[in-house]
Amino acid sequence: IAAHVISEASSKTTSVLQWAEKGYYTMSNNLVTLENGKQLTVKRQGLYYIYAQVTFCSNREASSQAPFIASLCLKSPGRFERILLRAANTHSSAKPCGQQSIHLGGVFELQPGASVFVNVTDPSQVSHGTGFTSFGLLKL
Amino acid sequence: IAAHVISEASSKTTSVLQWAEKGYYTMSNNLVTLENGKQLTVKRQGLYYIYAQVTFCSNREASSQAPFIASLCLKSPGRFERILLRAANTHSSAKPCGQQSIHLGGVFELQPGASVFVNVTDPSQVSHGTGFTSFGLLKL
Amino acid sequence: IAAHVISEASSKTTSVLQWAEKGYYTMSNNLVTLENGKQLTVKRQGLYYIYAQVTFCSNREASSQAPFIASLCLKSPGRFERILLRAANTHSSAKPCGQQSIHLGGVFELQPGASVFVNVTDPSQVSHGTGFTSFGLLKL
């Protein structure tokens, strides 16, 4: 069971990143699915290595004082979402903006029907060029 | 099937990074090989988690305006290469240069004879000290 | 065999990071253990994918000129420790400090009784907020 999906620009105002099965994507079988373009949902309980990579372009003067934060979140059936992993990068002083890449990854127990998704502080700063931003998992 | 190889400084003018089976490297068996010191080639079709880490040292004034970009690329038999993953980091203002590290990783389907390699915008900026820059894969 | 442990602030003056089985941690079975809150120790020989993520907050003026470096280290029975992976990030000019995240990961052969741990140049700069700093491994 494995998946690798590719970032997609979105006009939605949500902080949850959108993904697509496009380009050189992976969706090994129907035991993992991409739901609503935003979350990877697994049918089997078990340990999964889950990862995300987010490239963004921001400028210190044009951004809030808070850093750019990417969070990997878990939503189990009947529960509130919880944060599994976070990474933070202070905005660049480069103009118009400076690109930076964040990588998150870890091993977590998922229940049947659990979903994972990626949340960022400012989705408008995310880079969607080929290979820059992606999200995936693999069952151990 | 798994491999982990170590960066090697090169006098070549190519943007493709060079690797070696040295130090604490891994080459599990002959189903994965390091070819020409530049690419990991697999003999078996399947899903692989492929990763690379690149540490570099650059300065904004001494570099081009474009960021430092590391790309994980795939070359399948009889096809052009394609970019699987990219990460970008704006150059530092530190002098003489500021070190930064990039990590790339994802799950991809590889065909028999497929090769993966790492390309960077400026190989002269790459740090080759122990543990700083490496490249590997594992078959799921 | 898999583990994922969560960073813990420590009053110790050591540069080795401290970890705990808390929050959304993983410890699949007793073939991997967290020893002394600082190292993951495995009982079985084999290939492991080992990873660490470290988020830190530093300022160029308040820090030494040397970059912030995170190292993934191996201690095998009867041997000196050795560095497997390192990542370096130059300190930010943001005030009071600028957050940055480092991710390390690679495939390594471990012997029975081998331990892995994470070392940083300045543990006081490490961020211990939910999800920011973690450490884990999985057996292939």
């Epitope: 939503k75 529960r79 | - | 929050g23």
Partner: nanobody, 122 residues
Framework: EVQLLESGGGLVQPGGSLRLSCAAS????????MAWVRQAPGKGLEWVSG????????YYADSVKGRFTISRDNSKNTLYLQMNSLRAEDTAVYYC???????????????WGQGTLVTVSS
């Protein structure tokens, strides 16, 4: 010090609308689920609605489903409750509450605001 400050309550006619706000400080707002709980005059506490840390998951009591909408703005450290089609039985003091920790399977609260009074009457 954790502080939760509710506002937006008042007198409204049946069928009307109100928007409650809860300004949070003293903790990392975006890490915690939050909830609205109410207490009608002479009654016990009633859970109204809850929202996950990043706003992706919402739950509602059957009595308010389809009429109330919970939301949050993590950049402003603020929790909201949009109340439409208000009824007399919605009259209560509304409290915002913070999840005790972001690991609990069942929502347990450790901090509450002082509350804001909503009166629905003609």
């Amino acid at each position: 010090e954790v502080q939760l400050l509710e506002s937006g309550g008042g007198l409204v006619q049946p069928g009307g609308s109100l928007r409650l706000s809860c300004a949070a400080s003293g903790f990392t707002f975006e890490l915690y689920a939050m909830a609205w709980v109410r207490q009608a005059p002479g009654k016990g506490l009633e859970w109204v609605s809850g929202i996950g840390a990043v706003g992706e998951t919402t739950y509602y009591a059957d009595s308010v489903k389809g009429r109330f909408t919970i939301s949050r703005d993590n950049s402003k450290n603020t929790l909201y409750l949009q109340m439409n089609s208000l009824r007399a039985e919605d009259t209560a003091v509304y409290y915002c509450a913070k999840e005790a920790n972001n690991l609990s399977d069942n929502l347990v609260f450790d901090y509450w605001g002082q509350g804001t009074l909503v009166t629905v009457s003609s």
